[in-house]
Interface confidence: low
């Protein structure tokens, strides 16, 4: 399997999503797990509802969201207010017994708020005003491979 | 996999007009910041416009060469960026390129041709 | 308007061995918030400019950690490690500090 990077910034939402086989898969529930160093074991951070009829219902394991579209083919994945000891390596997994089959690895990185954490506020293009003002951040868009609302640069 | 995908370019005489298309897939395209970034045969790049998210309210902003001739829009139902060029001049004749802004131009398009000559 | 300017215009390389280009801003592109609105870039021949480096230091997704950024505010520098035949092509500097944004001239790297 070759590595998904998904880039989120810090205190926003990221989203993960893993695509498979709907068919392949059908009536198997799936698992969020965290690699634990490059050859230890996926420690399971969240599953998917223990009704396989009931996977479109989300599941939270603290920050951490679940939820299958078993019909399309897409596991998702919401990590809520990234922080910077969420970045690592992923999988998403299909469960048949006790075994799991690897749907995707995952890269998870997260990138600093360009803001600093000052108060979002608009953005200027020159003309419009004589002095910089933030640029406004939108506190829950998740992208992966840099699509997330990335603050844009100060302008003066 | 993130697109951008250029079309319209041409040759115009000067004083000419011409629209510029760039079909965004891939991403959520109401969530970014789109530009385009021309570049005259045999030179280097230049910024031309800017294009805001639905956050800021698409707000456009121009490279003073191009302002009051050229205006940016999108159609977020189509997913689709625009260059309407007015009043082109010789000094226009470049490959355009629409490029997605986040940290920089993280994406390109292939570019499209745009030749103003009589 | 900022000026950027690069040298050298043009770079002779040997793979396997380091390149480094300059660029020189007619402003600072320090902010206030710690980041330096500096961005690289490389056009392969025939092909779209791709990021490779933003806030002067810091790698675009997918690019080779043989390509590295540094620099003050307003001298910068983009250096490989060893060059590779992938690597020609022409690399620009960019600001991201204040419309409008501007582009070096552009250094044009090639195999010796």
């Known amino acids: 399997h070759n590595t998904t990077v998904f880039q989120g910034v810090a205190g926003q939402s990221l989203q993960v999503s893993c695509p498979y086989d709907s068919m392949k898969h059908w009536g198997r529930r799936k698992a969020w797990c965290r690699q634990l160093g490059e050859k230890g074991p996926c420690q399971r951070v969240v599953s998917t509802h223990n009704l396989w009829l009931l996977s479109f219902l989300r599941r939270w394991n603290g920050s951490t969201a679940i939820t299958d579209d078993t019909l399309g083919g897409t596991l998702t994945i919401t990590l809520r207010n990234l922080q910077p000891h969420d970045a690592g390596l992923y999988q998403c997994q299909s469960l048949h017994g006790s075994e799991a089959d690897t749907l995707r690895k995952v890269l998870v990185e997260v990138l600093a708020d360009p803001l600093d954490h000052r108060d979002a506020g608009d953005l200027w293009f020159p003309g419009e005003s004589e002095s910089f003002e933030d640029a406004h951040v939108e506190h829950s868009i998740s992208r992966s491979l840099l699509e997330g609302e990335i603050p844009f640069p100060p302008t003066s | 996999e993130v697109q951008l995908v250029e079309s319209g370019g041409g040759l115009v005489q000067p004083g000419g007009s011409l629209r510029l298309s760039c079909a965004g897939s891939?991403?959520?395209?109401?969530?970014?910041?789109m530009s385009w970034v021309r570049q005259a045969p045999g030179k280097g790049l230049e910024w031309v416009s800017v294009?805001?998210?639905?956050?800021?309210?698409?707000?456009?902003g121009y490279n003073p060469s191009v302002k009051g001739r050229f205006t940016i829009s999108r159609d977020n139902s189509k997913n689709t960026l625009y260059l309407q060029m007015n009043s082109l001049r010789a000094e226009d004749t470049a490959v355009y390129y629409c490029?997605?802004?986040?940290?920089?131009?993280?994406?390109w398009g292939q570019g499209t041709l745009v030749t103003v000559s009589s | 308007d900022i000026v950027m300017t690069q040298t050298p215009l043009s770079l002779p390389v040997t793979p396997g061995e380091p390149a480094s280009i300059s660029c020189q801003s007619s402003?600072?592109?320090?902010?206030?918030?710690?980041?330096?609105?500096l961005n690289w870039y490389l056009q392969k021949p025939g092909q779209s400019p791709q990021l490779l480096i933003y806030?002067?230091?810091t790698r675009a997704s997918g690019v080779p950690d043989r390509f590295s950024g540094s620099g003050s505010g307003t001298d910068f520098t983009l250096k490989i490690s060893r060059v590779e035949a992938e690597d020609v092509g022409v690399y620009y500097c960019?600001?991201?500090?204040?419309?409008?944004?501007?582009f070096g001239q552009g250094t044009k790297v090639e195999i010796k």
């Open positions: 402003k600072s592109l320090l902010h206030s918030t710690g980041k330096t609105y």
């Open positions: 806030w002067m230091s």
């Open positions: 960019q600001q991201f500090l204040e419309y409008p944004f501007t």
């Open positions: 294009i805001r998210n639905k956050a800021n309210g698409y707000t456009a």
């Open positions: 490029a997605r802004l986040t940290y920089g131009f993280d994406y």
């Open positions: 891939g991403f959520t395209f109401t969530d970014f910041y």
